[in-house]
């Protein structure tokens, strides 16, 4: 049950005062008490909680010769660089014997120019693309009203009338600066100025115009670039690998890409020195004086097959009566595709040419017409792919077979 007879006569003869000021201010709170006997340690409370790391100093002055005489104890709490977290109700707390005593409260308040919690940041945006900027400020005193400025021109008639924490910009066609002013009863604070750099939009509709075994012609549609003309576009091609990351949408190719620059217009480029019958991934970005656009997504493309670039090698042809035996080796020159087989042609001096498809074999036995008396018989061989025949070998004369 409540007991009201407990002695609670306070030893405090001086209580903490009040401090109100702007951020960064340094101030001191002071408590004074008069006690008999050994002076107690003075603890400081903020909003009812003991301050464990208080920057306090305690001075004790005896009022008599004897230790049991009265003492004056002064505790000073120093607040350096006042912050919002320092504000609140301050009291001194002492334990005297078996009793607890708490001083009357003093108050620490913050009042000054607005303080920015968030300011607009530099960024790049694509031309004519919406984006948001953030600004947040606080007092005290509240309220804090914001006024946004674009290229130093206010975007509202008065603070608090326009957008506040978030500014929505529907799009820009030139690089611009943005800042915000925070207004309260004490005055105005201006944020940092953010530079919003307008880059070209990502190109669209990257596509193949024509394909050759060793070159691809590609075209694209440029994006808007605001008031800044495009200076060039950059195309990258990289060999596709079945397990490559770009198919999973990874932003960077797994190896050094082949990079080509295109003057614009036209928004078209012939990529040469490619491997035939090879899958590639390509992408394009366009650049203005302000910087490059983002890359397009990787587009998978493939060079077509070509015809073999050289004839089969080491052709030998021998004749034995009405039969001829011909064999050869695969061309040393690039095949430019998948070898589908060989064609063979033979012809006598006064006879029509005979054309044969040998398939993938590299030897054949020919049954010659008649008794084999056809003179000056020659043989030619060519390799072929799906794209067509490669060059024919030089005619090889059929030599008579000599046993042994």
């Amino acid at each position: 049950a409540p007991r009201g007879t407990q002695a609670e006569e306070s030893p405090f003869v001086g209580n903490p005062g009040n401090i109100t000021g702007a951020r960064g201010l340094t101030g001191t709170l002071r408590c004074q008490l008069q006690v008999q006997g050994e002076p107690p340690e003075v603890h400081w409370l903020r909003d009812g909680q003991i301050l464990e790391l208080a920057d306090s100093t305690q001075t004790q002055v005896p009022l008599g010769e004897d230790e049991q005489d009265d003492w004056i104890v002064v505790s000073q709490l120093r607040i350096t660089s006042l912050q919002l977290s320092d504000t609140g109700q301050y009291q001194c707390l002492v334990f005297l014997g078996h009793q607890t005593f708490v001083s009357q409260p003093g108050y620490v308040g913050l009042e000054g120019l607005p303080y920015f919690l968030e300011e607009p940041e530099d960024r790049t945006v694509a031309a004519n693309t919406p984006f948001n900027l953030s600004c947040q400020a606080q007092g005290p005193p509240e309220p804090v009203d914001l006024l946004w400025l674009q290229d130093a021109v206010p975007l509202a008639t008065a603070p608090g009338h326009g957008p506040q924490r978030s500014l929505h910009v529907p799009g820009l066609n030139k690089t611009s600066s943005f800042s915000c002013e925070a207004h309260n009863a004490k005055g105005v604070t201006t944020s940092r100025t953010a530079t919003i750099t307008v880059l070209p939009q990502q190109p669209r509709n990257l596509h193949l115009v024509s394909r050759q075994p060793t070159e691809l012609e590609v075209a694209w549609t440029p994006g808007l670039s605001g008031i800044y003309p495009l200076t060039h576009c950059t195309l990258q091609a990289v060999l596709s690998d079945d397990g490559m990351g770009i198919q999973a949408g990874e932003p960077d190719p797994p190896e050094e890409p082949l990079t080509s620059q295109a003057s614009v217009p036209p928004h078209q480029l012939r990529l040469g020195s490619l491997h035939p019958h090879t899958p590639y991934h390509i992408r394009v970005a366009c650049t203005s004086s302000q910087g490059p656009s983002s890359w397009t997504h990787w587009l998978p493309v493939e060079t077509p097959e070509g015809v073999p670039l050289g004839p089969p090698e080491n052709i030998s042809a021998t004749r034995n009566g009405s039969q001829a035996f011909v064999h050869w080796q695969e061309p040393r020159a690039p095949l430019q595709g998948t070898l589908l087989g060989y064609r063979l042609a033979y012809q006598g001096q006064d006879t029509p040419e005979v054309l044969m498809d040998i398939g993938l074999r590299q030897e054949v036995t020919l049954e010659l017409q008649g008794d084999g008396s056809v003179s000056n018989l020659t043989v030619c061989v060519a390799a072929y792919t799906a794209a067509g025949d490669g060059p024919w070998s030089l005619p090889v004369p059929l030599e008579a077979w000599r046993p042994g």
Partner: antibody, heavy 118, light 112 residues
Amino acid sequence: QVQLQQPGAELVKPGASVQLSCKASGYTFISFWINWVKQRPGQGLEWMGNIFPGSSSTNYNEKFKSKATLTVDKSSSTAYMQLSSLTSEDSAVYFCARDYYGGSPDYWGQGTTLTVSS
Amino acid sequence: DIVMSQSPSSLAVSAGERVTMSCKSSQSLLNTRTRKNYLAWYQQKPGQSPKLLIYWASTRESGVPDRFTGSGSGTDFTLTISSVQAEDLAVYYCKQSYNLWTFGGGTKLEIK
């Protein structure tokens, strides 16, 4: 003389809310934490939460966070505890108590008996 | 959260006997800055508010008979009643105020 005065009893219907009061006198109200303690019939004491009148800072026992809301009115030196969505489980005696920073003297109200019944 | 455990939950003794009850906390209640153990003992009789007996683990509240003694430090605390009287029939609670408040489950003292 320090006193914490609480109404003797409250009767409310299930599902309703109730605001319990604790009027302080005889000391500097804004300087000391007010705690609220629940005691169901035949059970022990359960700390529910506390409030520092000087700044209205509060702490809650996790168990009562969605049940209780603590407020103060400095002008009348009164602490309040609002209890919401009442059920028979909320039928109990509710004490308010002043915390003297772990020391003495500490003071308790006489308690309010809350009965939740239709 | 600090958990307080009291034992025994009840005990019955004859008048004049000595009684001890225990209270353990899940963490130390000694504040190194104030050099005090933030543990209190309360007595609650039926239909009454809890009454403070001991604070700072061992300091007797004024007006409390000297047969009540508190001891211990850190995490282990004891309340001793040197010679139980009939009016001591009550439930005894320990309470920590080191970090917010937590009560022990109580020890019910009955007189044989």
